[in-house]
């Protein structure tokens, strides 16, 4: 006689919403083996029994969690195999706060994983990374766990939040930190990661404040090149004047990225240009407020963005994306900035 269970593991993790079939079969020299599943909750999957085999179909609902046992008998001999089924939920739904970090400020970073199950601190771990290493000197504050508000009843998913106080990020500041969340399940380790970009000052190491009108460029990779050229700005009297922005390369290596600069002949119009290679296109993917309210012109390797009606550019983040490759460059335009009409 042979008794087989497929998959053969004694613990099986099933993603919520996905189905899994566990087949238990037995061959019998004398006649047909009797095979059945027992220890089933009424809601735990459905069973299809055939001569010599039984198939348990798990639907990937939280109620499917349990330990069914397959029992096979042939004459006077019997075998059994238990399978611990764990249904989990771990979508790629990380939210970080703040959206970007300012060097030189004592700040708290939070990372929230949404719609999680099981909500067990032993299964879920958070890490704040600089590159591939844990950020030294970060202080973990107390974790928080809250039940998500669900549209349908009977699905108690949770959100878990970890906060850290940051150490000094040093000079020059790194381009980004990452929040990494890992779920450790039987024979399965899942990881999601979310970037927390760090503002890179163009002209001064000081963090921005309410009176500063200094633009900041943000890059999404440590090997990024982010350049803003020709953006001539004047500030209101309350803020000190800043020099004309000059290109600033964060790293000489890595993928070439689009460049953002002001179209000097068009007043407050931003131009995004592909920085390398034929067949590359660029498009605007982010602007303060609703991108649809801006006037856009896209022509292959160039894309323009202007305010409707014509006026000063709105304060906030502008992002341009280059394809193929998906490289992005972000430009932060601060408040209290007006176009320099003399330029």
């Amino acid at each position: 006689q042979s008794f087989q269970v497929n998959p053969p593991e004694s613990e099986v993790a099933v993603a919520m919403g996905t189905s899994l079939q566990i087949t238990c079969s037995m061959s019998c020299d004398e006649g047909v083996a009797r095979v059945h599943w027992r220890g089933l909750d009424t809601s735990l999957g459905s069973v299809q029994t055939l001569p010599g085999s039984s198939i348990l179909s798990v639907r990937g609902m939280l109620s499917d969690t349990g330990t069914p046992v397959c029992v096979g008998s042939c004459g006077s001999r019997s075998f059994q195999h238990s399978v611990k089924i764990l249904v989990y939920a771990f979508p790629d739904q990380l939210v970080v706060s703040p959206e970007f970090l300012v060097p030189g400020q004592d700040q708290v970073v939070s990372c929230t994983a949404h719609n999680i199950w099981p909500a067990d601190p032993n299964s879920l771990s958070f890490a704040l990374l600089l590159g591939e290493q844990r950020l030294e000197g970060a202080q973990a504050l107390e974790p928080e766990q809250e039940e998500e508000i669900q549209e349908a009843e009977g699905t108690p998913l949770f959100r878990m939040t970890q906060r850290w106080r940051l150490p000094s990020l040093g000079t020059p500041a790194p381009p980004a930190l990452h929040c990494q969340v890992t779920m450790q399940l039987p024979k399965l380790v899942l990881t999601h990661r979310k970037e927390i970009p760090v503002l890179q000052s163009q002209t001064s190491p000081k963090p921005p404040n309410t009176t500063s009108a200094e633009p900041y460029i943000l890059t999404s990779s440590s090997t990024a090149e982010a350049v803003s050229t020709g953006l001539n700005i004047t500030t209101l009297p309350s803020a000190p004047p800043y020099p004309k922005l000059s290109p600033r390369t964060l790293s000489s290596e890595g993928p070439c990225r689009p460049k953002i600069h002001q179209d000097l002949e068009a007043g407050w119009e931003l131009l995004c240009e592909a920085s390398c290679g034929p067949g590359v296109t660029v498009r605007w993917t982010l602007a303060p407020g609703d991108l649809a309210t801006y006037h856009k012109r896209e022509a292959g390797a160039q894309a323009w963005l202007s305010v409707l009606p014509p006026g000063p550019m709105v304060e906030g983040w502008f992002q341009c994306r280059q394809d193929p490759g998906g490289e992005v460059t972000n430009l932060y335009v601060p408040g209290q900035v007006t176009p320099n009409s003399s330029s």
């Epitope: 004592d106 844990r134 030294e136 000197g137 202080q139 973990a140 150490p167 000094s168």
Partner: antibody, heavy 119, light 107 residues
Amino acid sequence: EVQLLESGGGLVQPGGSLRLSCAASGFTFSSYWMHWVRQAPGKGLEWVSYISGSGGYTNYADSVKGRFTISRDNSKNTLYLQMNSLRAEDTAVYYCARDRPYYYDLDVWGKGTTVTVSS
Amino acid sequence: DIQMTQSPSSLSASVGDRVTITCRASQSISSSLAWYQQKPGKAPKLLIYAASSLQSGVPSRFSGSGSGTDFTLTISSLQPEDFATYYCQQYKSYPVTFGQGTKVEIK
């Protein structure tokens, strides 16, 4: 000179309340996270609570959660600890302490104020 | 919570002796450790931060070492004013926790 000075301690009956204060001077109070740490007679140090510089983040030791409330008034450079439902095991010297940005050690401590909970 | 275990709980030493106090964390805390000195009736005083950095104004006979889970405070040549209780503290994660203390007494 950087200084922290606690006040408000005293004798209180079990179930009673007290409000401790900590007056800060010599530094930019609002830039620092502040803590309360206590020490029962003849025992070691026990962290009680913290509050961030702006007051937006607070946390408590499990032993005092739901009974103690930390707060601060940055315009008065003062830290507070409201202690309700006091128990005999809360009897201790209470210290306020400042923690340093980026390092998180407690680099400045007050002299302490004594709280005695007894009937 | 991270447990901090100090040893010994007390020790007797003479002026001029080299004294070593150890502190062990129940899990890795990197270098997020401080050492404090406390004299009877007084508030604790910061001696060492970040496991091995000497706090400003603290005599150089005090030194700290270690990272991860095992840490050491060393007083290279014990002075009369060093007789006190010493505490380690981890601040890697909340709740921050202290060791139970090591009392250094005169032999």
